[in-house]
């Protein structure tokens, strides 16, 4: 199908709707597939909801935006900025993001075009 | 050699139409976006419009839509540009360059650059 | 006025640095990767940056680039005479679906 596009909506907007999901689960998900079962990370309960579980409860609040497609970047930066000063070295870091950027695909979401995930100002 | 070659461009009078061409030869334009930037004289680069090579995405800047119309044929390696509606803000040197876009987790930029064409409008 | 703010001209003396800041907003720098030209007088633009940090090949070590939130930088050490030209940013903006240039700085090697 051609699509033209016009303009996609304020990013202002996408700020409103990532403040009003919940993105607990969707960085609980990562850092249990980056962590495995491990126990050094122990900010969460990790051992108390399965993996699974968890990306499920991820995709149902991404869903949970209006207009999930549009804001999925707005999203993904969040998590990054929330989780970036739990990561304790670059490698972790490389991981995350890249279990990160695997997201929308597991979700069944079409990876956001454009998307600069360095957004923590060189923290990460 | 990868090079993009434009053509079309020349003199024409307020409200008319031109047809720009971009021509590539050393690479496959079909994976690549494509793009349109314009320069008026002693100005600055200004992006025009994009378009994905199989035509299922095109932006345009907000001053030019409805007026300018980007596409592709992939059969010929070409992009065209067809401008109607001309005035004198669209007095300009014509690039196209190859988009280094990707699907996703990238930004667009520019590594191939056209010579340029000239546009000129005036009565 | 281009959306994407540059100041119109920086100098630098031969072999010293300089930086070429590009300010932008959340909707373009702040979300999106900033792409950074080189135009010599009477030429083509050419790429010098990518995705914020990457270079092409071809382009030198001296010339790197950053961004934090929302400005970009490009630093070009060791000033030579052949980088006199017009530099300029550019960015994809998420609100108005189109791609920025910022006004261009042009750089003098002193």
């Known amino acids: 199908m051609r699509r033209e596009r016009g303009r996609q909506g304020d990013s202002s907007s996408c700020e409103r709707q990532v403040d009003r999901v919940n993105l607990k689960p969707c960085e609980q998900h990562i850092m249990q597939r980056i962590m495995g079962e491990q126990e050094q990370y122990d900010s969460y309960d990790i051992r108390s909801t399965r993996s699974s579980d968890q990306q499920q409860r991820c995709c149902d609040e991404l869903n949970e935006m209006e207009n999930t497609q549009r804001c999925m970047c707005e999203a993904l930066q969040q998590i990054m900025e929330n989780q970036c000063d739990r990561l304790q070295d670059r490698q972790m870091v490389q991981q995350f993001k890249r279990e990160l950027m695997n997201l929308p695909q597991q979700c069944n979401f079409r990876a956001p075009q454009r998307c600069d995930l360095d957004v923590s100002g060189g923290r990460c | 050699q990868k090079q993009l070659v434009e053509s079309g461009g020349g003199l024409d009078q307020p409200a008319g139409s031109l047809k720009l061409s971009c021509k590539d030869s050393g690479f496959t334009l079909s994976t690549f976006y494509m793009t349109w930037v314009h320069q008026a004289p002693g100005k600055g680069l200004e992006w025009i419009a994009n378009i994905k090579q199989d035509g299922s995405e095109k932006d345009y800047l907000d001053s030019v839509r409805g007026r300018f119309t980007i596409s592709s044929d992939n059969t010929q390696n070409m992009v065209d540009l067809e401008m109607n509606s001309l005035t004198a803000a669209d007095m300009a040197i014509y690039f196209c360059a190859r988009n280094g876009l990707q699907d996703s987790y990238s930004g667009d930029f520019f590594d191939h650059w056209g010579q340029g064409t000239l546009v000129t409008v005036s009565s | 006025q281009p959306a994407l703010t540059q100041p119109s001209s920086v100098s630098g003396a031969l072999g010293g640095s300089v930086t070429i800041t590009c300010s932008g907003t959340g909707s373009n720098i702040g979300h999106n990767y900033v792409s950074w030209y080189q135009q010599l007088p009477g030429s083509v633009p050419k790429l010098l940056m990518f995705?914020?940090?990457k270079r092409p090949s071809g382009i030198p070590e001296r010339f790197s680039g950053s961004k934090s939130g929302t400005t970009a930088s490009l630093t070009i050490s060791g000033l030579q005479p052949e980088d006199e030209a017009d530099y300029y940013c550019?960015?994809?903006?998420?609100?108005?679906?189109?791609?920025?240039f910022g006004g261009g700085t042009k750089l003098t090697v002193l």
């Open positions: 995705d914020n940090t």
């Open positions: 550019a960015t994809w903006d998420a609100d108005l679906s189109a791609v920025l």
